[in-house]
Each structure stands twice: as structure tokens, then as C-alpha cells.
């Protein structure tokens, strides 16, 4: 049960995380105008990875896409790449993890294959989450650098009577969405990897009658006992059932050869 729950929860958390990464990538509020120095501005600027927008106090919002590719800062291109890689890896991870879910049966898929798929999707989620966190962090660092640069510029060369207020940008909502989403995807990936460890076959489980040399009467339950092969297999992880009610994870799934703890 614990394995299925861990795997299922990992999948759901990753799904939410990837949805968040997609949302953050598409959002226009990666950087928003800092109103500290000019709180009375009637025009509000904000920028995303793909376009910059201006919202006038009339409610009219005008957005302009970055129609150049070569003219954009390398850092912005890098952030775009990281976010896209994160989305692609996450999407593939989701696809893989759907088939890896223990609660979904696809033909006569081996549980060992499911374990491998769970691990693969987990690693993909981890990398996806790291890409998103890295992308958002690079952008945030870029903002901080520019913020202090423009602050320095703001207080120089103002000897004249005319003031020129330089627009400074601060963290937008997309950054926080990205950080949270990346973190969730990362957590989901770790959960999938943990679930994989629980799914991994350690012993062979025979459906045949388990014969015991001792003379005690042992109630036979098909698939209920874990029989050691006797070839130096690790017996310390053996689960001995007392014939009581068993959880879903402990119930043998008949098309498969192994029963994983």
C-alpha cells in the first residue's frame, strides 16, 4: 500500500509541478515594474519570457512579443531553454510514469519493468524540477543585477532640473510560481524514486506449494509466503504473513511473477 501511495502521490505532485512550470513559462509577469520610487505611476510595466506588456490605468493592456531571436540577451535565451527542457522532460516523465503506475495494468507488463519506468520518470522529474528552479533563479539573479545597476544610474547625473525616472524591475509572480512548481516536480521525482526502491524485486516468489521440513501444520495460502530460493538470497527482508488481512501492495498480482515489498 505504501509503495502505491508513494508512487501515486509522487505522480500527482509532479503533475501539479509540471503544470506550474508550464504556467510560469507562459506567464507575462516574470519581472514587474518596481513602484517603490514612483508609486504614483499611471502606467505599469511587466515582462515575460516571450513578450513585454504595459498596463495603463485605463485598464488597456498592450503586449509586444520579442520578435527577434538574435537581439535578445543570452541569459534570457538560456532561461527559455531551461524552462522548455524542464517542460519536455516533465511531459515525457509524466507519460512514462502513467504506464509505471502500480494501479494501472497494461497487458502482461512485468513489475520489474514498472520499477524501471518509475525510476526513469522519477529521474526525469528531478531533472525537470532542477531545470525550472535553475531557469527561474538565473532570471532572478539577472533582475537583481539589473535592479542595482539601474539604482546606481538613478542617483547619478541628476544635476539638472529635469528628472528622468528609470524604470526598475523586481520579481514577478511567475518567478514564485516557477520556484514552487520546480520544487514540487523535484519532490514528486524523489517520491517516484523512493517508490521504485519499494517496487524493485528482491526475491522470487513461487506460486507453488511452500513445503516446510518442520512438522508444524502450516496453512497454505497461495502466494502468501515468500519462499527463499536457498541460493544465498537475502532472507532478512522476508515478510512473514500471519494469515491476517493484507494490504493492496501485499496481494499478489497474478499476471506477474514477483510480489514486491
Amino acid at each position: 500500500m505504501a509503495v502505491t501511495a508513494c508512487q501515486g502521490l509522487g505522480f500527482v505532485v509532479s503533475l501539479i509541478g509540471i503544470a506550474g512550470i508550464i504556467a510560469a513559462t507562459c506567464m507575462d509577469q516574470w519581472s514587474t515594474q518596481d513602484l517603490y520610487n514612483n508609486p504614483v505611476t499611471a502606467v505599469f510595466n511587466y515582462q515575460g519570457l516571450w513578450r513585454s506588456c504595459v498596463r495603463e490605468s485605463s485598464g488597456f493592456t498592450e503586449c509586444r512579443g520579442y520578435f527577434t531571436l538574435l537581439g535578445l540577451p543570452a541569459m534570457l535565451q538560456a532561461v527559455r531553454a531551461l524552462m522548455i527542457v524542464g517542460i519536455v522532460l516533465g511531459a515525457i516523465g509524466l507519460l512514462v510514469s502513467i504506464f509505471a503506475l502500480k494501479c494501472i495494468r497494461i497487458g502482461s507488463m512485468e513489475d520489474s519493468a514498472k520499477a524501471n519506468m518509475t525510476l526513469t520518470s522519477g529521474i526525469m522529474f528531478i531533472v525537470s524540477g532542477l531545470c525550472a528552479i535553475a531557469g527561474v533563479s538565473v532570471f532572478a539573479n539577472m533582475l537583481v543585477t539589473n535592479f542595482w545597476m539601474s539604482t546606481a544610474n538613478m542617483y547619478t547625473g541628476m544635476g539638472g532640473m529635469v528628472q528622468t525616472v528609470q524604470t526598475r524591475y523586481t520579481f514577478g509572480a511567475a518567478l514564485f510560481v516557477g520556484w514552487v512548481a520546480g520544487g514540487l516536480t523535484l519532490i514528486g521525482g524523489v517520491m517516484m524514486c523512493i517508490a521504485c526502491r519499494g517496487l524493485a524485486p528482491e526475491e522470487t516468489n513461487y506460486k507453488a506449494v511452500s513445503y516446510h521440513a518442520s512438522g508444524h501444520s502450516v496453512a497454505y495460502k497461495p502466494g502468501g509466503f515468500k519462499a527463499s530460493t536457498g541460493f544465498g538470497s537475502n532472507t532478512k527482508n522476508k515478510k512473514i504473513y500471519d494469515g491476517g488481512a493484507r494490504t493492496e501492495d501485499e496481494v499478489q498480482s497474478y499476471p506477474s511473477k514477483h510480489d514486491y515489498v
Epitope: 515594474q33 504614483v40 505611476t41 485605463s58
Partner: antibody, heavy 119, light 113 residues
Framework: QVQLVQSGAEVKKPGASVKLSCKAS????????MHWVRQAPGQGLEWIGM????????NYNEKFKSRATLTVDTSTSTAYMELSSLRSEDTAVYYC????????????WGQGTTVTVSS | DIVMTQSPSSLSVSVGDRVTMTCKSS????????????LTWYQQKPGQPPKLLIY???TRESGVPDRFSGSGSGTDFTLTISSVQPEDFATYYC?????????FGGGTKLEIK
């Protein structure tokens, strides 16, 4: 067509209050900001503030913040401006103006209401 | 508050003349986000409300004759009437649209010579 019809002229004593109305027609009242601007005799224009009928959100000129109150009645598509503690320098023509969508500038103005403050 | 200064305060011209009036703001009205200048020009005739002529410093309002043109950026702006017509004799106001409170210039009165 868009029309902003303002209430009639008012004569008030110093210290009194006046409530001016501006009835809008010919457009979706709740979609546009309504501005209030005044013009003293022989003087220039002075922005008082603005209100968004949909949200009730307001923005005032600090000079009038303590005395002016902007309200709307969406059921009758009417905007109101109340000015309290009137003084002689408040004698002016008061205009309501519809917010232009696509620019910050108002594009339709009422005919104006003359307010005279005299003892 | 942004202070808007218009010059000259009055101008005597003849019909057909080319007229230029200026407006200076104490702070830049250029928005870096879209490279637009948030300055508006109005025309007001006696006993009438102002009429919007130009917004974003150079964009003519629909229905405004093309003899009216606006130019300038940052803090210095100009309204030009290429050939003054009899109906153009009025007072012209510039307005800061960039920052609250929206402030108007003192006006330039265009009079018949």
C-alpha cells in the same frame, strides 16, 4: 452616441457641500473610468480624480482627497462627485469625462456644471 | 507632482499660418516599457469642454484633422498646426498622463492677428 449629461448649476455657501451628477449613455458604463476635472474662471484645468464604475476603485488628486468623494450608481449609469467644506476658490466649472480605452486620455466630456461658492 | 509648463501663453497668428507651441514637463513622460510618451493635447473653446486632439504625444485622435501633429519625447513636446483654420482659434492644453495626479499645462491661447 456617447453622452455625458451633467446636473445643473449650483450656488453654495462656504463650508457647505455639493454633490454633482453625471449621467452616462451610449456605452457600457461599467467598462470605462470616469474622471472629474475642474476649471476655475479664466484658469486652466485641474484633475480631481477618477473612479472605475465596475470595481468602485478610485484615484484622487492628493489636493482633493480629504474633501472629494467619487461614487457611482451602476443601475442608473450615473457618476457622482461630492465636494465638502466648500470655499470661494472652489468656484469653477466641474467636468466629468469618460476614460478613453486605448489611451489614458478622456475622450468624452460632459457639458460641465458651474458651482459658485459665495457668502 | 509633475509640473507642466506651456509656452507661449498666447499666440497671435493669421489664418493659413504654421503654428508651433511647446510643452515641458518636470519629469520624463517616456515609458521605457513601450517607448511611448504619455502626453496628451487638448483644444478648448470658450464655454465648451476640452476636446482630445492627440495622445501618446503623437497619436491623433480619430476625427482630428491631419493639420494637427504632435511630436517630442521625454520632457519636451510640441504641438504643430500646419495651416491654421478659423475654427482652430482656441486654448490648447497639454496634460501629463504618466503619473498621478494627472496635471495640465497653463495653456496656450491661439488668437487671431
Amino acid at each position: 452616441q456617447v453622452q455625458l449629461v451633467q446636473s445643473g448649476a449650483e450656488v453654495k455657501k462656504p463650508g457647505a457641500s455639493v454633490k454633482l451628477s453625471c449621467k452616462a449613455s451610449g456605452y457600457t458604463f461599467t467598462s470605462y473610468w470616469m474622471h472629474w476635472v475642474r476649471q476655475a474662471p479664466g484658469q486652466g484645468l485641474e484633475w480631481i480624480g477618477m473612479i472605475h464604475p465596475n470595481s468602485g476603485s478610485t484615484n484622487y488628486n492628493e489636493k482633493f482627497k480629504s474633501r472629494a468623494t467619487l461614487t457611482v450608481d451602476t443601475s442608473t449609469s450615473t457618476a457622482y462627485m461630492e465636494l465638502s467644506s466648500l470655499r470661494s476658490e472652489d468656484t469653477a466649472v466641474y467636468y466629468c469625462a469618460r476614460r478613453y480605452y486605448g489611451s489614458i486620455s478622456p475622450d468624452y466630456w460632459g457639458q460641465g456644471t458651474t458651482v459658485t461658492v459665495s457668502s | 507632482d509633475i509640473v507642466m509648463t506651456q509656452s507661449p501663453s498666447s499666440l497671435s497668428v493669421s489664418v493659413g499660418d504654421r503654428v508651433t507651441m511647446t510643452c515641458k514637463s518636470s519629469q520624463s513622460l517616456l515609458n521605457s516599457g513601450n517607448q511611448k510618451n504619455y502626453l496628451t493635447w487638448y483644444q478648448q473653446k470658450p464655454g465648451q469642454p476640452p476636446k482630445l486632439l492627440i495622445y501618446w504625444a503623437s497619436t491623433r485622435e480619430s476625427g482630428v484633422p491631419d493639420r494637427f501633429s504632435g511630436s517630442g519625447s521625454g520632457t519636451d513636446f510640441t504641438l504643430t498646426i500646419s495651416s491654421v483654420q478659423p475654427e482652430d482659434f482656441a486654448t490648447y492644453y497639454c496634460q501629463n498622463d504618466y503619473s498621478y495626479p494627472f496635471t495640465f499645462g497653463g495653456g496656450t491661447k491661439l488668437e487671431i492677428k
